[in-house]
């Protein structure tokens, strides 16, 4: 060892996972979603796991039923705390129809634009939460293809509550929501027995979203 060699006390920086993702959550807010508190609880549990900021993960929320509303844009809030406060205030907008294709398409065309805070080169993730077959399901093929063309990763969540409450077959509904999810479907599609059960998938969903960055 050289006589000039010195031992210096230093602290290695904490390994930081730079989770740069632009995430848009597309929420079904039609009349059949009940109770809405379960949706906001799900949002709270999911969002509090995220490191939200202009140089980290950004989150935007779109709500749809008959029409589509941008609840907040990707660049609206610059911390997890701010987003949590905003998400708690989201009210159910209702609507007699469930226009899922329109909700997804609006998210793709509008929520993921630079004007609304999307960043160039940052991975785009869409999380779609719905409780019923869409009235515009004949438009889904195009909408999903458009998302594919723009490399938007899609996680879809089917809430079976209204089907179970009405003792109805969920087969067609599950098939539709599976078709929305990115491949491999088993890693991108979730179903829950009812709205209250949404919180049970948060951990796995969060892990799978952030695995995208790795």
């Amino acid at each position: 060892v050289s006589p000039t060699f010195q031992v210096v006390n230093s602290i290695a920086p904490v390994q930081e996972c730079s989770t740069q993702l632009d995430i848009v959550i597309v929420l079904d807010g039609s009349n059949s979603i009940y109770p809405w508190d379960s949706v906001t609880a799900f949002l709270n549990d999911l969002l509090e796991r995220m490191d939200i900021g202009p140089k980290q993960t950004q989150v935007g929320i779109v709500q749809y039923g008959e029409n589509v509303t941008h609840e907040f844009n990707l660049n609206k809030y610059s911390s997890t705390e701010e987003v949590l406060v905003a998400a708690k205030k989201i009210v159910q907008r209702g609507g007699r129809q469930t226009m899922t294709a329109l909700g997804i398409d609006t998210a793709r065309k509008e929520a993921f634009t630079e004007a609304r805070g999307a960043r160039r080169g940052v991975k785009k993730v869409m999380v779609i939460v719905t409780d019923g077959e869409s009235h515009d399901n004949h438009r889904l093929k195009k909408v999903i293809q458009d998302c594919e063309d723009e490399n938007i990763q899609r996680f879809s969540i089917a809430i079976l509550g209204s089907y179970n409450r009405g003792n109805l077959s969920t087969e067609k509904f599950v098939e539709e929501i599976k078709s929305i999810a990115s491949e491999p479907t088993e890693k991108h599609f979730f179903n829950v027995s009812d709205e209250l059960a949404l919180v049970t998938i948060v951990k796995t969903l969060g892990e799978r979203i952030f695995a995208l960055e790795a």
């Epitope: 329109l102 515009d136 093929k141 458009d146």
Partner: antibody
Framework: QVQLQESGPGLVKPSQTLSLTCTVS??????????WSWIRQHPGKGLEWIGY???????YYNPSLKSRVTISVDTSKNQFSLKLSSVTAADTAVYYC?????????WGQGTTVTVSS | EIVLTQSPGTLSLSPGERATLSCRAS???????LVWYQQKPGQAPRLLLY???SRATGIPDRFSGSGSGTDFTLTISRLEPEDFAVYYC?????????FGGGTKVEIK
């Protein structure tokens, strides 16, 4: 630019099957951003949607015609086709093919089909 | 199915005048799924407006659209000779896709 051209017999006998083909030029039918539609217009009347197909083969039909309609696609030929079975005089119309994205933005010029013995 | 009712059936106007065409739906239609077409005799329809109010490529700005829910309007601010034709509204949010019965804009 994309152009569409309908082809097929102009005269079909009652109870037979009407068959039309739409050839797409200037663009690929396999580009997944459009549905490929058939629409008809009875003489002096309005427009009626028959159905459409996605390049993957998924079809959507007007329930009023569903039992008699088949739409298919041949991506290798850049064509899609309409078959309407058990025709009657009420099926006499101008048949159009069209590209449907956000509305039907490209149409064929239409072909007149007369059902008569 | 969603029934679209257009009124009036015929509109008789002179060039330079303003034309207002109505399309009423039997149930709510998202404006994103409402389109307007123009058709001249012996020709295929031509897309004018999509999303209820967005002009298609090459459509002059004298054509405008508005409305939401069940009531939609197509306005031609100053009629040109080439605007005399039949106009159709169409919805594609619910299957089956449906067209209105059309409004004929004729020269007075």
């Amino acid at each position: 630019q994309v152009q569409l051209q309908e082809s097929g017999p102009g005269l079909v006998k009652p109870s037979q099957t009407l068959s039309l083909t739409c050839t797409v030029s200037g663009g690929s039918i396999s580009r997944g951003n459009y549905y490929w539609s058939w629409i008809r217009q009875h003489p002096g009347k309005g427009l009626e949607w028959i159905g459409y197909i996605f390049y993957s083969g998924s079809t959507y039909y007007n329930p009023s015609l569903k039992s008699r309609v088949t739409i298919s696609v041949d991506t290798s030929k850049n064509q899609f086709s309409l078959k309407l079975s058990s025709v009657t005089a009420a099926d006499t119309a101008v048949y159009y093919c069209a590209r449907d994205g956000y509305g039907m933005d490209v149409w064929g010029q239409g072909t007149t089909v007369t059902v008569s013995s | 199915e969603i029934v679209l009712t257009q009124s009036p059936g015929t509109l008789s106007l002179s060039p330079g005048e303003r034309a207002t065409l109505s399309c009423r739906a039997s149930q709510s239609v998202s404006s994103s799924y409402l389109v307007w077409y123009q058709q001249k005799p012996g020709q295929a329809p031509r897309l004018l407006l999509y999303d209820a109010s967005s002009r298609a490529t090459g459509i002059p700005d004298r054509f405008s659209g508005s409305g939401s829910g069940t009531d939609f309007t197509l306005t031609i601010s100053r009629l040109e000779p080439e605007d005399f034709a039949v106009y159709y509204c169409q919805q594609y949010g619910n299957s089956p896709l449906t067209f209105g019965g059309g409004t004929k804009v004729e020269i007075k």
